[in-house]
Structure formats: structure tokens, C-alpha cells
């Protein structure tokens, strides 16, 4: 069966949208009005991993681009990236783990939490136009509490 | 503040090898997508290859593409380009750039001659 | 191999605004291709005037903008000074596969 996806975009907390600067630039920043138009929007697939009532395994590609989000051991520390992939074999449903999120709601508040590496987050920076980063700390200085809304097809 | 250092440079023949490095400082080098750059005498800038934050994605220029690898040690704060098989039209300042587009100061670069 | 085309030479009258733009032999340009503008003056490194088709670099006079118009990228400069004469670059990103990023052959502006 064909994974499940959906699309969507997601903003921290602080409702800072995440927009793309560059090819591999992902960065969080305040939008308004017609500059919302500029946030990614992501294509989240329900994929194999441990799953529990509140802990959810997905992957987040960016709608239409052959990039993921990826999580990689980088000179000895766990660091998230944009990876290209083959969009001829992505996305499936037993994604590599590097590719896996435990999406994690809590309070109406969503975490992603790295399945690859357990207790780091998907984070964003308090300071605006700032990479979104993989983080090992919660409920710190930098932001890993997000909102999703949901984008029609 | 933002700051990009680049060395390696220097006078080599055809065929011959150079390590360039990019020490990056004033900014969260672990984070960014960094990019390399070079200017031949007289000519306009050239886009010679960039890197994502882990390594696992690179691009380069078609002009270098099989002779240069680009990588970067964020533990160190590092960015390095490798140039092997060096061409006589490789000879310019590389620049080290934030960002895959290039979007940052630019540093005074380091000049590469490639002459026999 | 796609080449990025800019006007060699322009001109303009202190004060006048002029439009400075970036194409692509084949094809339009669009936000996917994450235009950049360049400033140099001879003997200087180049400066990053806008980024990601219309963000302007720190330090940036609000006097530079970009903006895709039609298929093309766009630098426009408003009230221009007698310091911006210079060479002015744009590159774009070839996500067709090559994944590199290829800057034009630049625009000479004269203020006159």
C-alpha cells in the first residue's frame, strides 16, 4: 500500500513560519498578510517506526521538492539537514531512520523528536531569521513546541 | 560579527593538488549551508560549490565537477575545498561564503595560481 | 548547458531609477531559483546586495529591491546615487538535477 501523507505547514510557539532562503536554508521567521504565501509546505508521511497513542513516526518532506529532513551524526554531533533524494523512491513507507520524527503532541503543542537520536528536537532559535537546528535541550532558551495546519491537496 | 578566513592558496603547476579552509566565526557555522566562490582576474564571480549543514548534500560548478570536493568539519568550524587535476583556468581568488547562494559578507578570499 | 543572461552595459541619470535584470537562456525564472544580487567595484570582494529573490542584506539602502518580473529576476534601483556605479551580478540555483548554482555575466552601471 501506498504511504499515507498530508500536506501542511508548521509554525513554533512564538508563530514563527518556516520559509525556504536557499536550496538548503531552512529558517523560521514572523510573516504577515500576503508574505504567509512564502512558508514551506511540507508533505508529512505516516511511516514504520514505534508508535504509541501520543508518538507518531513520520517523515517531512518539502512539498514538490525532492528534499527531506534528515538527521545525521556530524562530526560527532547529532545535526539536522536538507537531503536530496530520489523522488522516484521517496517517499515509502520504511524510510531510512535518518528521515524518522516521533511527532509527539502534547498539550496541543507538537515536538518532533529524532528517532535516530532519542531527546533531540527539531528547533528553532527565540532570534528571528535564524536555521531551524536539531537541539538537545527542551524547555530551554531555543523553541521545540510547533503548530500544524493543515493544507488542502 | 560575521567573519570567513580563508587560506590554502598559493602558486602550484597543472595537474598539481591544493587544500583551501574557510575558518568561519560570528554565527552558528553547524547550522548554516556554506558555499565556496571564485573570481579570475578580470572576470566576474563564479559559483564553485556548496554543502548542506551535514555533508550529505553538495553541489558544484560543471567547470570543477570530478576534480574538487568540498566538505566541512562543524566541529571545528571549518569549511575546505579539495582541487585536484588544478587547470590554469582554475587561477582566482575562492571565497568562502554562509549560505548555498552565497549571501553573506565576503571575506578577502585566497588567491590560486595555477602556472608551469 | 543553461547560461544566465544579464544586460552588459546600463545607464542611468543621478536620481533616475533603473531595472537591471536575470534570465535564463531556456526557461523562466521563478522564487525556486533563489535569485541573489551582487555589487562589486573594481578592486573590491563582491557584496551581497539582496538574497532569495527580495530580501535585502544588512546594511542594504532601502533604495535596492528585487522582484521577479515576467520569466526574469529583477534588481531596481530608486534614486540612484553616483556610488552605484559598479558591476552588478545575479545568480540563480539549477535545480534541474545539477544541483549547483551559476551567477550571469553581470551588468556594467553608469551614473551620468
Known amino acids: 500500500a501506498p504511504v499515507r501523507s498530508l500536506n501542511c505547514t508548521l509554525r513554533d510557539s512564538q508563530q514563527k513560519s518556516l520559509v525556504m532562503s536557499g536550496p538548503y536554508e531552512l529558517k523560521a521567521l514572523h510573516l504577515q498578510g500576503q508574505d504567509m504565501e512564502q512558508q514551506v509546505v511540507f508533505s508529512m508521511s505516516f511511516v514504520q517506526g514505534e508508535e504509541s497513542n501520543d508518538k507518531i513516526p513520520v517523515a517531512l518532506g518539502l512539498k514538490e521538492k525532492n528534499l527531506y529532513l534528515s538527521c545525521v551524526l556530524k562530526d560527532d554531533k547529532p545535526t539536522l539537514q536538507l537531503e536530496s533524494v530520489d523522488p522516484k523512491n521517496y517517499p515509502k513507507k520504511k524510510m531510512e531512520k535518518r528521515f524518522v520524527f516521533n511527532k509527539i503532541e502534547i498539550n496541543n503543542k507538537l515536538e518532533f523528536e529524532s528517532a535516530q537520536f532519542p531527546n533531540w528536537y527539531i528547533s528553532t532559535s527565540q532570534a528571528e531569521n535564524m536555521p531551524v537546528f536539531l537541539g538537545g535541550t527542551k524547555g530551554g532558551q531555543d523553541i521545540t513546541d510547533f503548530t500544524m495546519q493543515f493544507v488542502s491537496s | 560579527e560575521v567573519q570567513l578566513l580563508e587560506s590554502g592558496g598559493g602558486l602550484v603547476q597543472p595537474g598539481g593538488s591544493l587544500r583551501l579552509s574557510c575558518a568561519a566565526s560570528g554565527f552558528t557555522f553547524s547550522t548554516y549551508a556554506m558555499s565556496w566562490v571564485r573570481q579570475a582576474p578580470g572576470k566576474g564571480p563564479e559559483w564553485v560549490s556548496g554543502i548542506n549543514t551535514g555533508g550529505g548534500s553538495t553541489g558544484y560548478a560543471d567547470s570543477v565537477k570530478g576534480r574538487f570536493t568540498i566538505s566541512r568539519d562543524n566541529s571545528k568550524n571549518t569549511l575546505y575545498l579539495q582541487m585536484n587535476s588544478l587547470r590554469p583556468e582554475d587561477t582566482a581568488v575562492y571565497y568562502c561564503?554562509?549560505?548555498?547562494?552565497?549571501?553573506?559578507?565576503w571575506g578577502q578570499g585566497t588567491q590560486v595560481t595555477v602556472s608551469s | 548547458q543553461t547560461v544566465v543572461t544579464q544586460e552588459p552595459s546600463f545607464s542611468v541619470s543621478p536620481g533616475g531609477t533603473v531595472t537591471l535584470t536575470c534570465g535564463l537562456s531556456s526557461g523562466s525564472v521563478t522564487t525556486n531559483n533563489y535569485p541573489g544580487w551582487f555589487q562589486q567595484t573594481p578592486g573590491q570582494a563582491p557584496r551581497t546586495l539582496i538574497y532569495?529573490?527580495?530580501n535585502r542584506h544588512s546594511g542594504v539602502p532601502s533604495r535596492f529591491s528585487g522582484s521577479i518580473l515576467g520569466n526574469k529576476a529583477a534588481l531596481t534601483i530608486t534614486g540612484a546615487q553616483a556610488d552605484d556605479e559598479s558591476d552588478y551580478y545575479c545568480a540563480l540555483y539549477m535545480s534541474s538535477g545539477s544541483n549547483n548554482a551559476v551567477f550571469g555575466g553581470g551588468t556594467k552601471l553608469t551614473v551620468l
Open positions: 561564503a554562509k549560505d548555498w547562494m552565497a549571501t553573506t559578507p
Open positions: 532569495n529573490t527580495n
